[in-house]
Amino acid sequence: KSPIFGPEEVNSVEGNSVSITCYYPPTSVNRHTRKYWCRQGARGGCITLISSEGYVSSKYAGRANLTNFPENGTFVVNIAQLSQDDSGRYKCGLGINSRGLSFDVSLEVSQGPGLLNDTKVYTVDLGRTVTINCPFKTENAQKRKSLYKQIGLYPVLVIDSSGYVNPNYTGRIRLDIQGTGQLLFSVVINQLRLSDAGQYLCQAGDDSNSNKKNADLQVLKPEPELVYEDLRGSVTFHCALGPEVANVAKFLCRQSSGENCDVVVNTLGKRAPAFEGRILLNPQDKDGSFSVVITGLRKEDAGRYLCGAHSDGQLQEGSPIQAWQLFVNEESTIPRSPTVVKGVAGGSVAVLCPYNRKESKSIKYWCLWEGAQNGRCPLLVDSEGWVKAQYEGRLSLLEEPGNGTFTVILNQLTSRDAGFYWCLTNGDTLWRTTVEIKIIEGEPNLKVPGNVTAVLGETLKVPCHFPCKFSSYEKYWCKWNNTGCQALPSQDEGPSKAFVNCDENSRLVSLTLNLVTRADEGWYWCGVKQGHFYGETAAVYVAVEERKAAGSRDVSLAKADAAPDEKVLDSGFREIENKAIQDPRLFAEEKAVADTRDQADGSRASVDSGSSEEQGGSSR
């Protein structure tokens, strides 16, 4: 007995499409072996029509596909534009056609529903609008116009020109009579329901001379589009519902048991808690289309999603909808990385961001997710040397360790830095990941002075105290700029006295600036790393002033100036439109705008954006 299972009989009508799902035991071998769909011949052979290895018969060209879902142990054969010639006996199977791992499927394609003579067929999607046109002759121009629906054997009045409207259609139907020149009336039904489907009769006049026209209304429930994405990756649902609902509230919901559809996000500001920090509803285009991006996909995100439009911002009968069935592949190509990173006030975090290693030359970005309205993610830093003004001196994006991972370092943390951040590139949009930064109680591990003032032409020594827990780490000083942090020579001055309960393994490492010049002004970081993996950092701002009295300056922790007040957000902050995040091709345009703004406010002045090789040092 074959372990493959599927539908024994499939029935459809000409012009329609079918989705045939075949189930197989999801063993490792089965998941990766060839899947096929073949037609059984009279003499017992089975001719392949489509396979998972890319073969498509000329009979199926442009109208069929085969999708394997290894995680679920299923594969789906979609066949469109059916004709009666497609009727026959088929097999869906694994491996080689002649072997026994297959299931017999009978497909019968019939001519379609028998319709009355002169019947106009209207095929419309659920939730949309249909206009049924009803011609009449001059003698009935002044007579009553009506539309009936055939319920069983009886016609039931739906609407007429005297003002009657059947209660089932209240608020969503109208009867329009064209100008005197045109012998036509039309009935417009909005927010179509599945129950609206059926045979209709429109009539002008009520006597034996009345004009009648038959109409067959077919209301289609949308076929869910199959979407298969990797665990920890991201998915984008593009929703195009048409211009007629451009000004109606939009939503994305996920079907739970039964017919409930729980709102995931809508344009009225609702968002499901499970998606906090990892969802964006991109602004609508003029035609009413929008898209929803979900990152950090979890196993439990799998399911059926509907997008739609309704004034309530949730699924109601008659909402126009689009549907997707999301499968989340647990055999993910996206590596595990921490989803929560903790730091202390005044301290730092180093976040590892995965990217598709095939796209090492792509531009890397880091943005801060904001939940207001439909969510947005303004960029904070990129790998091309742009840093948002408010983050200068405390944020750096490093290409290291490379080979599929980049690093983002944020220091001088405050409680306001808590939140969700997205790692993304202008390459593979599926590799968007989310990390939550949490600010916890505690003291920074590295101790440095606050602001330091150096004197032109003199020598400055700045200390950094490393506790013994970092004894095995490489310790460094570097000078921060937009493109990273260039390593500087530093001196190990032996054990530090800044830590209680810390033995000889603690360290005081100093940065020495000889013959200070104006160019030495700026942010300096001390930090720890292991190979290409970065740990904690601490930042010091060095100001340079004219000489007052001779001598060199040796800064201690006690002498340090108070930390500067935190900079407040100004109105010129840079934000990538959500659309740009969803479609990296838009980055280039946005970047150009941002660059001119950066130059205008001076934040790019004197930045040498040389290659990482030229910059050398431990941080680039």
């Epitope: 499939v10 989705s19 017919e259």
Partner: nanobody, 126 residues
Framework: QVQLVESGGGLVQPGGSLRLSCAAS????????MGWFRQAPGKEREFVTA??????????YYADSVKGRFTISRDNARNTVYLQMNSLKPEDTAVYYC?????????????????WGQGTLVTVSS
């Protein structure tokens, strides 16, 4: 909510026939699959047959044990699914349950259907 009511069960001799009906009411427009399961005394509930539909296409599934003997069909207008059982055997004796599922994608053989009827007893005995 969806309500399912089975009928047509009873006593029949081996080799005889029986037709079960399952009438659905409530929010039936969201149903994508209806199936029949059975549970014999002291045994686990098992899949018998199912019918799935999407647009004007339908898909019929059968357990190996009933292939060629049982036929599932659907009357769209009446929101009813039928199970025609021919060549009945004593081992077909069980309580037959009708079930409805909203998803087009779940394996129809699994018992994780969204709605269930109360069941109707079929006894095959001479």
């Amino acid at each position: 909510q969806v309500q399912l009511v089975e009928s047509g069960g009873g006593l029949v001799q081996p080799g005889g026939s029986l037709r079960l009906s399952c009438a659905a009411s409530g929010r039936t427009s969201s149903i994508s699959t209806m199936g029949w399961f059975r549970q014999a005394p002291g045994k686990e509930r098992e899949f018998v047959t199912a019918i799935r539909w999407s647009g004007s296409s339908s898909y019929k599934y059968y357990a190996d044990s009933v292939k060629g003997r049982f036929t599932i069909s659907r009357d769209n207008a009446r929101n009813t699914v039928y199970l025609q059982m021919n060549s009945l055997k004593p081992e077909d004796t069980a309580v037959y349950y009708c079930a409805a599922q909203m998803s087009l994608w779940r394996d129809p053989r699994e018992i994780d259907y969204d709605y269930w009827g109360q069941g109707t007893l079929v006894t095959v005995s001479s």
